[in-house]
Amino acid sequence: WSSKVLMSSANEDIKADLILTSTAPEHLSAPTLPLPEVQCFVFNIEYMNCTWNSSSEPQATNLTLHYRYKVSDNNTFQECSHYLFSKEITSGCQIQKEDIQLYQTFVVQLQDPQKPQRRAVQKLNLQNLVIPRAPENLTLSNLSESQLELRWKSRHIKERCLQYLVQYRSNRDRSWTELIVNHEPRFSLPSVDELKRYTFRVRSRYNPICGSSQQWSKWSQPVHWGSHTVEENPSLFALEA
């Protein structure tokens, strides 16, 4: 299956077309209260959460969420089958992986069942809203006396779809050194000082081949290499070159 399956419409901005509909003109004396914005994220292409701020409603209201894809076998809206709740009020919907189509426009409609004319529709490109799991199994190995290689694993999403951000620092550094690694879950540091203790961590995002997600995963668990002296407070070295 092609690595170029990517960017169907990944280069478009996420479109949030809020379409507020109302009843016939003679009933327009009371303005329609806007509905909260729906935010969707696809977690590791395993499930998707679409949430909204239920506390923005003036009265506790169980809003309903319906969704469909712009081009699909079944073009009718289907209602959420697994609502998320905040203080017993609907505040989101969890959608299982079988219902996730990354490369079709996702159309989501939030509605007030008490006032059916009060509804908002948004269109989202899900391939830009993927958040991977944090990388796992970070391992360090010596390529030579002074060269280190860091490797890691990502679960479920193919490596070529991911971009990684590697951060490392020694106990003598005030800040992290960071760099982007594309698709290959490995990074080598050409020169390390064996008298220093180094810390490494990695996070990933679904970008740029298969989507254009700007959201990074959580950081991996850190791994350490080098001198096992007590880690010193970097601020002590703030004046060093």
Epitope: I45, Q101, H156
Partner: nanobody
Amino acid sequence: QVQLQESGGGSVQAGGSLRLSCVASGDVYGRNSMAWFRQAPGKEREGVAVGYSVVTTTYYADSVKGRFTISEDNDKNTVYLEMNSLKPEDTAMYYCAADGNLWRGLRPSEYTYWGQGTQVTVSS
């Protein structure tokens, strides 16, 4: 549109191996699920294995689990079906299929695009 072309079929003794290839061309968005199916004479077409464009998940029919492996080579736009420990009951015409939706399963009705097929014959 997606075009699919299978190759690699042939005749083999029971216990032998074959590797089928499916070269895909055309619309890349039409290939988010890619599967292998087979059809023996007088029988319905059945799903064998399916893989997906962006995730590592694969699914296999119970009858081939542990013997068949679906894999990909993105640079060549090719999907493979590695078939080991072949049995006479694996004799069939093997088809490659593709669909634009992620998470298609092993039902023929879920797939939009089909190849012409390649014949596999396993003799005892």
